[in-house]
């Protein structure tokens, strides 16, 4: 070994080395929450940059760069460090046009933290162990959330657009010149039937148990789905969409409620299999993947 | 295509009866309202009754007590006429808001028209 790669061993060795890095890590992520940070701290941005390119060149020095097996750029933790660095010269030296949208991986320079601190590494790596487990456990999720948003798109495609309308139109009027002229809240409101303090029309459907529309109103399927066009079955993203929100119990049982109203509580049973099937039993598989990973990883 | 074919129409003296029918031809999802109008020569077209599937019906005030509107299980809607007068000549039309699939939305079709004649 040269001297030169003996004293970086020594000093990337050494524990006083490990404290500096984690103190500048640390005192670069107080900087890095200033909202208007004062003009002297660019010097200080330099510091940093200069620490964290010495803390490189040190072990870059020590391990080699990359042609051994344990040379800098084999542990991943290091592609961290070296992205860092390359971006802060990138920010500062190259004029590349939007610079706010790199200045954003700074922000990685927090990650930094993980690798110096040893518990830390160990989680995040347990944690890493874990989405590689999960693989199986998310195709099969995707593909049951998939089959199900299927079967929701054959039953459900349209039905949420049902609303319930006024009777009363005028001699000349047809539902497609209303809908052409409707155009605030206001407007709607004076044609659709609302419930207080309700953003959408009243749901309703066509078969004899799903939600009937009050005296004077008539059940049409036209204009929007409700939530401002967001819930709905009418295709299969948004299908997947709705199954998802069900499986991670988002506000279900109002997404329940508006389908079951426009479709019939005869579908009830569509959700109740959806909720054992997605919410109680793959939520519960994704945790137990996890929670073995972890397990595994503390041994 | 979705059509709508009245039918019924004719003279008729005064005091007389007529029966008008309008069936949907085609195919047809849903059938929401089922509505009567009538132009009269030289002026607008009014409304003169509706059904609806819940059963709500309701009639212009100048045929209320005469005419009466009803619809069977198929895609039919009748119009039953009763003691008419000359002022009820007019051209009368069929108007359905329906559903031709249960993938289209809501919309509103005409019939052709039925000519009631009211004289002596």
């Known amino acids: 070994f040269s001297p030169l790669r003996r004293i970086s061993i020594k000093i990337l060795v050494h524990s006083l080395f490990s404290m500096l890095i984690m103190c500048t890590i640390l005192t670069n992520c107080i900087f890095m929450t200033m909202n208007n940070p004062p003009d002297w701290t660019k010097n200080v941005e330099y510091t940093f940059t200069g620490i964290y390119t010495f803390e490189s060149l040190v072990k870059i020095l020590a391990r080699g760069f990359c042609v051994g097996e344990f040379t800098f750029l084999r542990d991943p933790w290091n592609w961290l460090d070296f992205v860092v660095i390359v971006f802060a010269y990138l920010t500062e030296f190259v004029n590349l046009g939007n610079v706010s949208a790199l200045r954003t991986f700074r922000v990685l320079r927090a990650l930094k933290t993980i690798s110096v601190i040893p518990g830390l590494k160990t989680i995040v790596g347990a944690l890493i162990q874990s989405v590689k487990k999960l693989s199986d456990v998310m195709i099969l999720t995707v593909f049951c959330l998939s089959v199900f948003a299927l079967i929701g798109l054959q039953l459900f495609m349209g039905n949420l657009k049902h609303k319930c309308f006024r009777n009363s139109l005028e001699n000349n009027e047809t539902l497609e010149s209303i809908m052409n002229t409707l155009e605030s809240e206001e407007d709607f409101r004076k044609y659709f039937y609302y419930l207080e303090g309700s953003k959408d029309a009243l749901l309703c459907g066509f078969s004899t148990d799903s939600g009937q529309c009050p005296e004077g109103y008539t059940c049409v399927k036209i204009g929007r789905n409700p939530d401002y066009g967001y819930t709905s079955f009418d295709t299969f993203s948004w299908a997947f969409l709705a199954l998802f929100r069900l499986m991670t119990q988002d506000y279900w049982e109002n997404l329940y409620q508006q389908t079951l109203r426009a479709a019939g509580k005869t579908y009830m049973i569509f959700f109740v299999v959806v909720i054992f099937l997605g919410s109680f039993y793959l939520i519960n598989l994704i945790l137990a993947v996890v929670a073995m990973a972890y397990e595994e990883q503390n041994q | 295509e979705v059509q709508l074919v009245e039918s019924g129409g004719g003279v008729v003296q005064p005091g007389g009866s007529l029966r008008l029918s309008c069936a949907a031809s085609g195919p047809v999802f849903n059938i929401n309202r089922m509505a009567w109008y009538r132009q009269a020569p030289g002026k607008q077209r009014e409304l003169v009754a509706y059904v609806t599937p819940t059963g709500d019906i309701s009639y212009a005030d100048s045929v209320k007590g005469r005419f009466t509107i009803s619809r069977d299980r198929s895609k039919r809607v009748y119009l039953q006429m009763n003691s008419l007068r000359p002022e009820d000549t007019a051209l009368y039309y069929c108007?359905?808001?329906?559903?031709?699939?249960?993938?289209?939305?809501?919309?509103?079709?005409w019939g052709q028209g039925t000519l009631v004649t009211v004289s002596s």
């Open positions: 108007r359905a808001l329906l559903q031709p699939d249960r993938y289209s939305n809501t919309r509103t079709y």
